[in-house]
Interface confidence: low
């Protein structure tokens, strides 16, 4: 048996993945647990095995289909249950009526590349991954640039309030190594959150020409 408070949080990547984290204060000794997804109006259901990510939390990914397939829509409800084995039976530990498009977290942007770099400027582009066509242009981005001697947490956030998959960084220092990250968020969804940050893109500004500032 399990005592203590539990928290069950899931996000939909807008296409074919629901990622869940279940936290439980009470100890779970050698207990097998899983998340079961039961859509309200669809033939399929799906299960994933919860794996420990810390002493009191477990995570798993419900893979609903091919990465770019649109498995759920804005009017779907998925009943999500945490089931843990107790002897020969499964016990329901947590349950929620999950509204996918109210609980969105997209995949991190991919394919970051330097389009053009100068001494003080750098133009960077990226792509969004596995994002639903339902959003049309209703997405926003946050970007940050890591300067030498600073941490990511200290980097100021640049906000792009529209679906703009590029940025022109200005007022950079010549001949300097930088790193850049971006994340994305749909405008839709009461509990929607930012995607993870993209993999950092490293770039170096061009050196200043001798005797002149480009």
């Amino acid at each position: 048996a399990v005592n203590g408070t539990s928290q069950f949080t899931c996000f939909y990547n807008s296409r074919a993945n629901i990622s869940c984290v279940w936290s439980q204060d009470g100890a779970l000794q050698d207990t097998s647990c899983q998340v079961h997804a039961w859509p309200d109006r669809r033939r399929w259901n799906q299960t994933c095995e919860l794996l420990p990510v810390s002493q009191a939390s477990w995570a798993c990914n419900l893979i609903l289909g091919a990465p770019d397939s649109q498995k759920l829509t804005t009017v779907d409800i998925v009943t999500l249950r945490v089931l843990c084995r107790e002897g020969v039976r499964w016990r329901v530990m947590a349950i929620q009526d999950f509204k996918p498009f109210e609980n969105l977290r997209l995949m991190a942007p991919i394919s970051l590349q330097v389009v053009h770099v100068e001494t003080h400027r750098c133009n960077i582009s990226w792509e969004i991954s596995q994002a639903s066509h339902y959003f049309e242009r209703h997405l926003e981005f946050e970007a940050r640039t890591l300067s030498p001697g600073h941490t990511w947490e200290e980097a100021p956030l640049l906000t792009l309030k529209q679906k703009q998959e590029w940025i022109c960084l200005e007022t950079l220092t010549p001949d300097t190594q930088y790193e850049f990250q971006v994340r994305v968020k749909p405008l839709q969804g009461e509990f929607t959150t930012w995607s993870p940050w993209s993999q950092p893109l490293a770039f170096r500004t061009k050196p200043a020409a001798l005797g002149k500032d480009t």
């Epitope: 309200d40 109006r41 349950i95 009526d97």
Partner: antibody, heavy 119, light 106 residues
Framework: EVQLLESGGGLVQPGGSLRLSCAAS????????VHWVRQAPGKGLEWLGV???????DYNAAFISRLTISKDNSKNTVYFQMNSLRAEDTAVYYC?????????????WGQGTLVTVSS | DIQMTQSPSSLSASVGDRVTITCQAS?????LYWYQQRPGKAPRLLIY???NLASGVPSRFSGSGSGTSYTFTISSLQPEDIATYYC?????????FGQGTKVEIK
Amino acid sequence: EVQLLESGGGLVQPGGSLRLSCAASGFTVTSYAVHWVRQAPGKGLEWLGVIWSGGSTDYNAAFISRLTISKDNSKNTVYFQMNSLRAEDTAVYYCARAGDANYDGFAYWGQGTLVTVSS
Amino acid sequence: DIQMTQSPSSLSASVGDRVTITCQASQSVSFLYWYQQRPGKAPRLLIYDTSNLASGVPSRFSGSGSGTSYTFTISSLQPEDIATYYCQQWSTYPLTFGQGTKVEIK
């Protein structure tokens, strides 16, 4: 065989409230959502709200302040309560369930129960 | 709310005629349904997801369309098809129905 059976209709005073029941058989209300739809005399169909298999609800915003949908899983029954009734709430009230496949629509309907709001 | 507008609101046709009803949505919808309602009866699902025939529905009924414009067809009208037909969208809440098309036999 999937069946839905509404009850609780009849004459209600203006300003009063109504409580309808929808008894389900052939499936469990813990596995399927149940919707409510009404039809005023000689008029079209109007979706009112739904209770999902896990117990949460969605309502038509036009009725959210005076509508409550609930259920008793042990009785496999869904309840519909509407307050502050007026003459224009006179209608046949249906409970309905979607089918099993992708977006099957309302494949199963109750026979409907007539509610008349009049003094 | 998405408004669903059916036309015509009523029609009269002869047995064996091809009958077409259109449903126009005020914005693009992904999933459209057609129902038949005979007098004094509950609605009956005929077409789901735009063009799929519901279980037990005769093949003379069909549906097509996309975006904001949808069509329902009875290829050869039969006496038992006398009813009111409704379209319904299931793309966003609240779910909404068309105002209905009453089909009569000449």
